[in-house]
Interface confidence: low
């Protein structure tokens, strides 16, 4: 009769470093001590006729254990294969490019250290939860790669690497390890430069909007914009609308920037840069300033009118040009009554980069002169009917403007000037019409001849 030596459990699977309870038993009636043959650390836990129980500890690798016993002068053996499974110690997705151009391939690279049994270990590369590649882990460490075509949809997508240790055939389930995700940033930067809209000329100490626009940019919100006037960086407001980026800034020219300058717009995305430059002339245009030697002149005095402006500016005063650009224009006159209220006009012209810029200014002269009564406006002999309504039309002039009063000779009777009044025979007589101001008096004699109305 043949007797058997059973080893239980048969072909167990356990986690690396774990312990295993092993039972060896035989139906041989005359069995001696049962031995466990293994290099593993073991401890006899219990034994009896035809059986022995052992505890194996710190099982770190695959191993074959053998139980043996002597029965009727011969040895019988039984064996069991221990399979140890080990989860990977490191599952890591290699860093992704900081920025990946849309439409170009990039490589996902996953490194797996340790993990056994290798035949049951699979490496999966993922975008979100979508499988991009599934490959067995072969070497140690295992490296698995996949080539991916970058798209807009990949911007901000998490990529990760997962290991699957499939111990389901052994009844232990599927052990999954996942790497830390890495986020991809994709971008589109057109080859065309930005559209830079800037003034051709900018006056010192003035401001003007500058616009820089680039279409077909993705993601527009991530782009960096640098706007500058010469070496002066401009404070830009950046707005995105879809794939269009618009940067707006206000350029203010300083006095030290006068001359030919450049406005620069740089758009940087994904470590790449697009640049646009526009020429700009910063100019200074002072004046024109029109001056009178006496804003208020006395009649007969000499008045000098001068007009000046900044360098390179050609001025023309009342049609008379200055000798050369940058020079003042002057004229002199003897102030007369007719010059009172006269305006002097000065125009200034500056050539900037082939364009002519114009500005105007004016000043008004006041001339002080004594009172006068215009005989043409003041009849010296009036024939009016009694009990009728009339107006004494007399006008005085002068600067300062004179007061005009008409008083009857030999009495203090006054008739209104320029206002309708009722005439009667008592108005008959000679009147002194006197215009007076701080600059003197002027008298004109007016005779009123009042014709009595017919009595009924």
């Amino acid at each position: 009769q043949e007797f058997l030596l059973r080893v239980e459990p048969q072909n167990p699977v356990l986690s690396a470093g774990g312990s295993l309870f092993v039972n060896c038993s035989t139906d041989c009636p005359s069995s001696e001590k049962i031995a466990l043959e293994t290099s593993l650390s073991k401890e006899l836990v219990a034994s009896g006729m035809g059986w022995a129980a052992f505890n194996l500890s710190n099982v770190t690798g695959n191993s074959r254990i053998l139980c043996s016993v002597y029965c009727n002068g011969s040895q019988i053996t039984g064996s069991s294969n221990i399979t140890v499974y080990r989860l990977p110690e490191r599952v890591e997705l290699a860093p992704l490019p900081p920025w990946q151009p849309v439409g170009q391939n990039f490589t996902l690279r996953c490194q797996v250290e340790d993990g056994s049994p290798r035949t049951s270990l699979t490496v999966v590369l993922l975008r979100w939860e979508e499988e991009l590649s599934r490959q067995p882990a072969v070497e140690e460490p295992a490296e698995v790669t996949a080539t991916v075509l970058a798209s807009r949809d990949d911007h901000g997508a998490p990529f990760s690497c997962r290991t699957e240790l499939d111990m389901q055939p052994q009844g232990l389930g599927l052990f999954v390890n996942t790497s830390a995700p890495r986020q991809l940033r994709t971008f589109v930067l057109p080859v065309t430069p930005p559209r830079l809209v800037a003034p051709r000329f900018l006056e010192v100490e003035t401001s003007w909007p500058v616009d820089c626009t680039l279409d077909g940019l993705f993601p527009a919100s991530e782009a960096q914009v640098y706007l500058a006037l010469g070496d002066q960086m401009l404070n830009a407001t950046v707005m995105n609308h879809g794939d269009t980026l618009t940067a707006t800034a206000t350029a203010t020219a300083r006095a030290d920037q006068e001359g030919a300058r450049e406005i620069v717009c740089n758009v940087t995305l994904g470590g790449e840069r697009r640049e646009a430059r526009e020429n700009l002339t910063v100019f200074s245009f002072l004046g024109p300033i029109v001056n009178l030697s006496e804003p208020t002149a006395h009649e007969g005095s000499t008045v000098t009118v001068s007009c000046m402006a900044g360098a390179r500016v050609q001025v023309t005063l009342d049609g008379v040009p200055a000798a050369a650009p940058g020079q003042p224009a002057q004229l002199q006159l003897n102030a007369t009554e007719s010059d009172d209220g006269r305006s002097f006009f000065c125009s200034a012209t500056l050539e900037v980069d082939g364009e002519f810029l114009h500005r105007n200014s004016s000043v008004q002269l006041r001339v002080l002169y004594g009172p006068k009564i215009d005989r043409a406006t003041c009849p010296q002999h009036l024939k009016w009917k009694d009990k009728t309504r009339h107006v004494l039309q007399c006008q005085a002039r002068g600067n300062p403007y004179p007061e005009l009063r008409c008083l009857k000779e030999g009495s203090s009777r006054e008739v209104p000037v320029g206002i309708p009044f009722f005439v009667n025979v008592t108005h008959n007589g000679t009147y002194q019409c006197q215009a007076s101001s701080s600059r003197g008096k002027y008298t004109l004699v007016v005779v009123m001849d009042i014709e009595a109305g017919s009595s009924h």
Partner: antibody, heavy 119, light 106 residues
Framework: QVQLVQSGAEVKKPGASVKVSCKAS????????MHWVRQAPGQGLEWMGY????????EYNQRFQKRVTITADTSTSTAYMELSSLRSEDTAVYYC????????????WGQGTLVTVSS | DIQMTQSPSSLSASVGDRVTITCSAS?????IYWYQQKPGKAPKLLIY???NLASGVPSRFSGSGSGTDFTLTISSLQPEDFATYYC?????????FGQGTKLEIK
Amino acid sequence: QVQLVQSGAEVKKPGASVKVSCKASGYTFTVYWMHWVRQAPGQGLEWMGYINPNTDYTEYNQRFQKRVTITADTSTSTAYMELSSLRSEDTAVYYCARWGGNSYGLDYWGQGTLVTVSS
Amino acid sequence: DIQMTQSPSSLSASVGDRVTITCSASSSVSYIYWYQQKPGKAPKLLIYLTSNLASGVPSRFSGSGSGTDFTLTISSLQPEDFATYYCQQWKSIPLTFGQGTKLEIK
């Protein structure tokens, strides 16, 4: 929001002058140039001139050079257009319009002021 | 002065039609602008810098061209599109407008 509000309709005799106002609100008045455009009844648009309120710099269409004056009062954010020596052919709707920088063209317009020149 | 000539001067079309208005400059310009005007109203900016839609303008409007020849296209006419359209340049003073194209219902 940006608004340009113009003064009311005017009836003038030939030889007289008219002054139309345009009050701006909703933006910084000195930053943008103000243009004036007119439209005779049943006709197209005709540009008259503009002012930079920041500097009082003006440019005019030579057709109006001697007769038009554009001014601006920054304290009230108001632009003015004065047309002198009026003739019957100046009968038109006069518009003020803001130039929003090269990117935007004449992006905001006043409601228009009808000026009628008749003896 | 740069003259801007639009063609046609007037045009009859139906709702849903595709319409093209051309604008020709007497000398080369960098950009043009298009405006829409309805009777009794101020003009409204449609397109700036030749091809950019102004804020709030429907995408059925588009602009193109360069140098001296420019076009405004309405891909599918809507009832509210019947109006007068003007092109404008400001390469040099004076700023000039085209004479206008009146778009009427057929």
